[in-house]
């Protein structure tokens, strides 16, 4: 048999080999396609199938406008005037070249060290299914789930059966002050064997954030408090996503869950010391605040009555 590739919407003529050039002809066309369930023999007189396929006076079969449902097998059998039988067999596949791919919502700026959306590449109106690929500085980007990730979506138009492909690219750009990377997207058709078509390239700038600024605030101000008062320590580290905050006392990590606020209720001498907070950001590592000293003013009589000494951790609370 012969493989035929036809463009959707275009006419297609299949020759019935060995058929007399004009009637009378002894020939039979039959087809098995998306429009049939088994073999359909076409009536030589024509009829309701004529809009899809009909036999021409020379015995060829005309498909006036090929559609997706016409993919399949077409066979002709003819007997010439000497009684010799000839068979023709065609395997028809169809295609439609989509519009040039484009990048929607292209990013103007990416943040170094942070996963950032580059854009969404769209190819509309193709058949059969092709593939979208991303390129950075001319090289194919392979998703690794870490620094490069791609989210793909395929939709099929309910009426035409044509495909729309979408591919969203996320990258975690490296810092280092080199030239910003150039991104492009390409569509490779499933049929026929054709070169890929490319979008225009985009070149978002890469912003490199400085180190985290971590500030520690204390209430009441100054850090000198009377016994039994409550001290509130607040750690500020503006960043997206919000960093995790851990607390230190006298250079030792406090065994508490992360929180931006540390409460010291009813302070006693055991709570005295130097406090700092450590902000840990997924893309920027840990950054420690300047320390703050907490002192409990006990008056002239020595330690406050009833205070227990020790680490004082039993009295700490996280807001």
């Amino acid at each position: 048999g012969q493989n035929i590739t036809a463009r959707i919407g275009e006419p297609l003529v299949l020759k019935c080999k060995g058929a007399p050039k004009k009637p009378p002809q002894q020939l039979e066309w039959k087809l098995n396609t998306g429009r049939t369930e088994a073999w359909k023999v076409l009536s030589p007189q024509g009829g309701s199938w004529d809009s899809v396929a009909h036999v021409l006076p020379n015995g060829s079969l005309l498909l006036p406008a090929v559609g997706i449902q016409d993919e399949g097998t077409f066979r002709c059998r003819t007997t010439n005037r000497n009684g010799k039988e000839t068979k023709s067999n065609y395997r028809v596949r169809v295609y439609q070249i989509p519009g040039k791919p484009e990048i929607l919502d292209p990013a103007s700026e990416l943040t170094a060290g942070i996963p950032s959306k580059v854009g969404t590449c769209v190819s509309d109106g193709g058949y059969p299914l092709g593939t979208l690929s991303w390129h950075m500085d001319g090289k194919l980007l392979v998703p690794d789930g870490k620094g490069v990730s791609v989210k793909e979506q395929t939709r099929r138009h309910p009426d035409t059966g044509l495909f729309t492909l979408q591919s969203e690219l996320m990258v975690t750009p490296a810092g280092g002050g080199g030239p910003p990377p150039t991104f492009s997207c390409s569509f490779s058709p499933g049929l026929p064997r054709r070169r890929a078509s490319y979008t225009a390239p985009i070149q978002p700038s890469v912003w490199e954030p400085g180190p985290l600024e971590v500030r520690l605030l204390v209430e009441p101000e100054g850090g000198a408090v009377a016994p039994g008062e409550t001290v509130t320590l607040t750690c500020e580290a503006p960043a997206q996503p919000p960093p995790q905050i851990h607390w230190m006392k006298d250079g030792m990590s406090l065994p508490l869950p992360p929180s931006p606020v540390l409460l010291l209720p009813e302070v006693g001498p055991q709570d005295e010391g130097t406090y700092s907070c450590v902000a840990t950001h997924p893309n920027r590592g840990p950054q420690e605040s300047l320390p703050i000293s907490i002192s409990v003013e006990t008056g002239e009589d020595g330690p406050t009555a009833g205070s227990e000494g020790g680490s004082g951790l039993g009295t700490l609370a996280l807001a």
Partner: antibody
Framework: EVQLVESGGGLVQPGRSLKLSCVVS????????MTWIRQTPGKGLEWVAS????????YYPDSVKDRFTISRDNAKSTLYLQMNSLRSEDTATYYC????????????WGQGVMVTVSS | DIQMTQSPSSMSVSLGDTITITCRAS??????VNWFQQKPGKSPRRMIY???NLADGVPSRFSGSRSGSIYSLTISSLESEDVADYHC?????????FGSGTKVEIK
């Protein structure tokens, strides 16, 4: 909204002629095959004639072949049925319908027009 | 020519009943069978296309099925507005052929 409006029916003597028209709106006329179907009083439906979208192919059952002619004017979005040598058995309500090929199986119908063949 | 043998010719049923009308094709017509509803004094309305597909705006109590050369229209939980004549049609081969019709009425 898709509309098909037939006209031209009436009482006619056997052997005489009559021409039915069907003006359509609400869709791209030249994208579709069109068909005339008739219904005799108290009886079933019968296919009368079909025409392809360009108008260059026409199809008839033996009962009306060589007497009836289906045609179309795509510029006017109008379908016609020229009926010659009318017989009493042609008495029926005639419907104009969209379709006739395997891709569109009569999804829209006109309101029908009555043709009575009687002396 | 293809014959479409439709049965029954009429049926008298109760509201809420489930009914099935069948058409037998005398030769293979594939999926190319439609069902039409026709109320008195009105034009036919397509209900099922290509044997099993529900036409736009048709209530889901209507369904079409096929077993070999037998095509069926089923109305589940019949309502008063379903009282009508029902016709099948094969449009695979010329001459296009309708069934003889089934009249559905309420007891």
């Amino acid at each position: 909204e898709v509309q098909l409006v037939e006209s031209g029916g009436g009482l006619v003597q056997p052997g005489r002629s009559l021409k039915l028209s069907c003006v359509v709106s609400g869709f791209t006329f030249n994208n579709y095959w069109m068909t005339w179907i008739r219904q005799t009083p108290g009886k079933g439906l019968e296919w009368v004639a079909s025409i392809n979208n360009s108008g260059d192919n026409t199809y008839y059952p033996d009962s009306v072949k060589d007497r009836f002619t289906i045609s179309r004017d795509n510029a006017k979005s109008t379908l016609y049925l020229q009926m010659n040598s009318l017989r009493s058995e042609d008495t029926a309500t005639y419907y104009c319908t969209r379709g006739g090929d395997i891709t569109t199986g009569f999804d829209y119908w006109g309101q029908g027009v009555m043709v009575t063949v009687s002396s | 020519d293809i014959q479409m043998t439709q049965s029954p010719s009429s049926m008298s049923v109760s509201l809420g009943d489930t009914i099935t009308i069948t058409c037998r094709a005398s030769q293979d017509v594939g999926i190319y069978v439609n069902w039409f509803q026709q109320k008195p004094g009105k034009s036919p309305r397509r209900m099922i296309y290509r044997a099993t597909n529900l036409a736009d705006g048709v209530p889901s109590r209507f369904s079409g099925s096929r077993s070999g050369s037998i095509y069926s229209l089923t109305i589940s939980s019949l309502e008063s507005e379903d009282v009508a004549d029902y016709h099948c049609l094969e449009f695979d081969e010329h001459p296009l052929t309708f069934g003889s019709g089934t009249k559905v009425e309420i007891k």
